[in-house]
Interface confidence: medium
């Protein structure tokens, strides 16, 4: 009689995380006696699965029933199959010994590959807020996805980005994966309003990426330009001088004025108004008593943005523009007023 | 008790070339055999593990490029398209009464060339 | 893939001293302590010193010792001799079912 074959016919099966696997075992004889057991691994480090004979499998159920007299098929059926369960499983038909029962023959094994949804991507950017012009890196992370292969793409606002780099960590065989990449964005003033998005395509999304996003404006700082105007005469020896600032982000902003360099008022921004792409203009305004000034004036508009050293724009404010009474012996009025606009 | 290699030599690129290791002077319930190799001045390589019952896998980079099978008396190593790469001497070594993974005995090993 | 990672890669000692070897695992051995050691000479196939991360083989002298556990292993070799000039290797078993060594340690014995 020809020699018992213990017949794998799935050299691999591929199934999702917390479904169940099927393993098929059959054997060509019922001789010699002896029982079955599965094993996961070939080596002195194989993990029993199942043991036809004794021992407690909860996840595993056999698919015939082995108690019948000529039984030859010995697939199992796992259940709540997890990433952890990845594996070569074999079949291994053992001969009746005393006292322990001797291996005989092993089937060719199965390999199990769990496939596992990859965790939504986390998106991060740099620590610090850089300007427009400068090259900045995001990074994408996601973890437990099983196979090994998959996609990444990065796009700002719909467009795809080329420039990044990407790995898939382990590199060799693992029970689950890890993806980790790095993108490098250059900033223009126009992207207050800007998104980054890491998408993921993995063959468990079934077409559907995962997407991770990151705002520009937690990155981006515009810097303010400055604009320093004399305004008509408001009234006899006043002059309303006014600082813009225009097309800063983010909001946090200290303006200070200064007269010939001495420090006149200091003001945080407050009521501002939002451009289109998501920058603010501000508007400052002194009024200058001329008659309390016998030279001219250095008006300087200070500004500091987020932190960062101060920007400043002067005007000049010639005096002599301005002829005071003679003989008058009317106390001047203060040198200069201020107002916020209304 | 001992293990030893056989079928080294002078190959080809692209010949297949299948080495035997054989065993003596063991009567146990359980044992495996692995194959190791060596290329001169280097370390050593697992190449991959077959049980007593005949059920074989392998290390990663070398799946697809070795097969290890079961004879009554031999386990034998296929190189299936050697590559200068595979010049090495090929060990084989068993593993049997302790659950670590240990490869107890080891075979002197047998020399492969592979050149044109 | 699981790597083994052996320091140093040469290690010099005087006979009656001690040598250290290092072997650090990318990922937790199977069972925390499916690491082995082993002792080549050239021409010669290896030789089984430590198997179960600190068990000593059968034959193999007390002044070899294993310890260690999980990624990280040692293997201490006192009371040098000559005989034990050599290259030394470990090896690791994983639950993915595969055996590898260690890059080796060359002793050499002054």
């Known amino acids: 009689e020809e020699e018992l074959q213990v017949i794998q016919p799935d050299k691999s099966i591929s199934v999702a995380a917390g479904e169940s696997a099927t393993l098929h075992c059959t054997v060509t004889s019922l001789i010699p006696v002896g029982p079955i057991q599965w094993f996961r691994g070939a080596g002195p480090g194989r993990e029993l699965i199942y043991n036809q004979k004794e021992g407690h499998f909860p996840r595993v159920t056999t698919v015939s029933d082995l108690t019948k007299r000529n039984n030859m098929d010995f697939s199992i059926r796992i259940s709540n199959i997890t990433p952890a369960d990845a594996g070569t499983y074999y079949c291994v038909k053992f001969r009746k010994g005393s006292p322990d029962h001797v291996e005989f023959k092993s089937g060719a094994g199965t390999e199990l590959s769990v496939r596992a949804k990859p965790s939504a991507p986390v998106v991060s950017g740099p620590a610090a807020r850089a300007t427009p012009q400068h090259t900045v890196s995001f990074t994408c992370e996601s973890h437990g996805f099983s196979p090994r292969d998959i996609t990444l793409k990065w796009f700002k606002n719909g467009n795809e980005l080329s420039d990044f780099q990407t790995n898939v960590d382990p590199a060799g065989d693992s029970v689950s994966y890890s993806i980790h990449s790095t993108a490098k964005v250059v900033l223009t003033r126009e992207d207050v309003h800007s998104q980054v998005i890491c998408e993921v395509a993995h063959v468990t999304l079934q077409g559907d990426p995962l997407r991770g996003t990151a705002n520009l404006s937690e990155t981006i700082r515009v810097p303010p330009t400055l604009e320093v105007t004399q305004q008509p005469v408001r009234a006899e020896n006043q002059v309303n001088v006014t600082c813009q600032v225009r097309k800063f982000y983010p909001q946090r902003l200290q303006l200070t004025w200064l007269e010939n360099g001495n420090v006149s008022r200091t003001e945080t921004a407050s009521t501002l108004t939002e451009n289109k792409d998501g920058t603010y203009n501000w508007m400052s305004w002194l009024l200058v008593n001329v008659s309390a000034h016998r030279d001219d004036v250095k008006l300087t508009c200070q500004v500091e943005h987020d932190g960062q050293p101060a920007v400043s724009k002067s005007h000049d404010l010639k005096v002599s523009a301005h002829p005071k009474e003679q003989g008058s012996n009317t106390a001047p009025g203060p040198a200069l007023a201020s107002a916020a606009p209304l | 008790q001992s293990v030893e290699e056989s079928g080294g030599r002078l190959v080809t690129p692209g010949t297949p070339l299948t080495l035997a290791c054989t065993v003596s002077g063991f009567s146990l319930i359980s044992y495996y055999i692995s194959w190791v190799r060596q290329a001169p001045e280097k370390g050593l390589e697992y190449i991959g593990i077959i049980n007593i019952g005949g059920g074989a896998s392998y290390a990663s980079w070398a799946k697809g490029r070795f097969t290890i099978s079961k004879t009554s008396t031999t386990v034998d190593l296929k190189i299936t398209s050697p590559t200068p790469e595979d010049t090495a001497t090929y060990f084989c070594?068993?593993?049997?009464?302790?659950?670590?993974?240990?490869?107890?005995?080891w075979g002197p090993g047998t020399l492969v060339t592979v050149s044109l | 893939a699981q790597v083994l990672t052996q320091t140093p890669a040469s290690v010099s000692a005087a006979v009656g001293g001690t040598v250290t070897i290092s072997c650090q695992s990318s990922e937790s051995v199977y069972k925390n302590n499916f690491l082995s050691w082993y002792q080549q000479k050239p021409g010669k196939p290896p030789k089984l010193l430590i198997y179960?991360?600190?068990t000593l083989a059968s034959g193999v002298p007390s002044r070899f010792k294993g310890s260690g556990s999980g990624t990280q292993f040692t293997l201490t070799i006192s009371d040098l001799e000559s005989d034990d000039a050599a290259t030394y290797f470990c090896q690791g078993g994983y639950r993915t079912d595969i055996y590898p060594f260690g890059g080796g340690t060359e002793v050499v014995v002054k």
């Open positions: 070594a068993m593993s049997y009464g302790m659950d670590t993974g240990a490869f107890n005995i």
């Open positions: 179960g991360a600190s």
